[in-house]
Interface confidence: low
């Protein structure tokens, strides 16, 4: 009822001391080679002169980090990246980075890469609001970081920030002009 030589599984390595004979009920645990991760049970058991169990090692490495337009990779380049390895990007001038500067190899897949955007980020005319208007003459194009202010028509009250700012090509949230409650 004893078991003889250990079974071999692709990319799996038996742990502990190797023996010629294993007693019934004895268990042997396997670990995976570099770049591989155990999928399911990691051990085999000797039952009636046969080994039961099938440790499976899955390739969790990544290749070819995502290409980011107008960016280059600044961390060391590898032909294969183990799960958990990070790759760092830098934007070419004059582009600005939005999102995480690093991607990570996560069980065979890369996390989302950043974007390198043109930092000009201009805005169009400010959004119109009900019962209110901007205090300056509206332009067709606004430079990044420029601000405009709103004012409400007579008898309406302003709720929120009266000033909005152009950031990354978008205006911040405009205020509302509410009709005051009349008692």
């Amino acid at each position: 009822t004893d078991c003889l030589s250990l079974p071999s599984f692709e990319n799996a390595i038996p742990m502990g001391e190797k023996k010629d004979v294993y007693k019934a009920g004895e268990q042997v645990t396997y670990t995976c080679a570099t770049y591989y991760k155990m999928d399911g049970a990691s051990n085999v058991t000797c039952i009636n002169s046969r080994w039961t169990g099938r440790p499976t090692c899955r390739d969790t490495s990544c290749v070819n980090p995502p290409t980011v337009q107008n960016a280059y990779i600044v961390s060391r380049q590898m032909s294969k990246y183990p799960s958990g390895e990070r790759v760092r990007y830098q934007c070419r001038s004059p582009y600005e980075m939005f999102g995480d500067e690093e991607v990570m190899c996560l069980n065979g897949n890369w996390t989302e890469p950043p974007q390198c955007k043109d930092s000009t980020g201009k805005c169009g005319p400010p959004p119109p609001i009900d019962n209110g208007d901007i205090t300056s003459f509206p332009l067709s194009v606004y430079a990044p970081a420029s601000s405009v202010e709103y004012q409400c028509q007579n008898l309406y009250q302003l709720e929120g920030n009266k000033r909005i700012t152009c950031r990354n090509g978008q205006w911040s949230e405009p205020p509302k002009c509410l009709h005051p409650c009349v008692i």
Epitope: G99, L106, P114
Partner: antibody, heavy 112, light 106 residues
């Protein structure tokens, strides 16, 4: 081990500002982004914004006009400031470390 | 913004039972994350990018899904699993969270 320690007032008057400092240890702000998330019984978990490792910030459009996030890498500190607070801003505010885009692994203890 | 609807809101299960929490998105998303939160504590990462268990999470947990429908499954629920579970999408800014599913053990 990785930690994010928050410090800031527990009580803010209406129309005043909330300022919270998040001091991190065991990792560098030059390598990891830090998110700000709040939690309230009425609205649940809400993502407010993030400051990335490179220093650029992304904000939730609903808060962009009254929220500012910046940091000092050398002091391992991230600074959060929200203006014009109202009663419906009552919540627990958390800073949390970025893990891949927009997911977080380690959280601060929260500021009520 | 993308709205995430979790169901059920409340779940009562006996130890050893199989439990599934569903998260539906108002538009298609690329991945879903899951967090566990216990009373008085900060949320903890539980499952990253749909199916990757965070460090220290027991193998009885699993995540799956695509498009607008995602789920978190516990194959045999244990007492320590009692908590609130939140899903989170990050395909479109702003990242949004589900309303939470509170799991109670009988």
């Amino acid at each position: 081990q990785v930690q994010l320690q928050q410090s800031g007032p527990g009580l803010v008057q209406p129309s005043q500002s909330l300022s919270i400092t998040c001091t991190v240890s065991d990792f560098s702000l030059a390598r990891y982004g830090v998110h700000w998330i709040r939690q309230s019984p009425g609205k649940g978990l809400e993502w407010l914004g993030v400051i990335w490792s490179g220093g650029t910030a992304d904000y939730n459009a609903a808060f962009i006009s009254r929220l500012n996030i910046n940091k000092d890498n050398s002091k391992s500190q991230v600074f959060f400031k929200m203006n014009s607070l109202q009663a419906n801003d009552t919540a627990i505010y958390y800073c949390a470390r970025n893990f891949g885009n927009y997911a977080v692994d380690y959280w601060g203890q929260g500021t009520s | 913004q993308i709205v995430l609807s979790q169901s059920p809101t409340f779940l009562s299960a006996s130890p050893g039972e199989k439990v599934t929490v569903t998260c539906r998105a108002s538009s298609s998303v690329k991945y879903m994350h899951w967090y566990q939160q216990k009373p008085g504590a900060s949320p903890k990462p539980w499952i990253f990018a749909t199916s990757n268990l965070a460090s220290g999470v027991p193998a009885r947990f699993s995540g799956s899904g695509s498009g607008t429908s995602y789920s978190l499954t516990i194959s045999r629920v244990e007492a320590e699993d009692a908590a609130t579970y939140y899903c989170q999408q990050w395909s479109i800014i702003p990242p949004t969270f589900g309303n939470g599913t509170k799991l109670e053990l009988k």
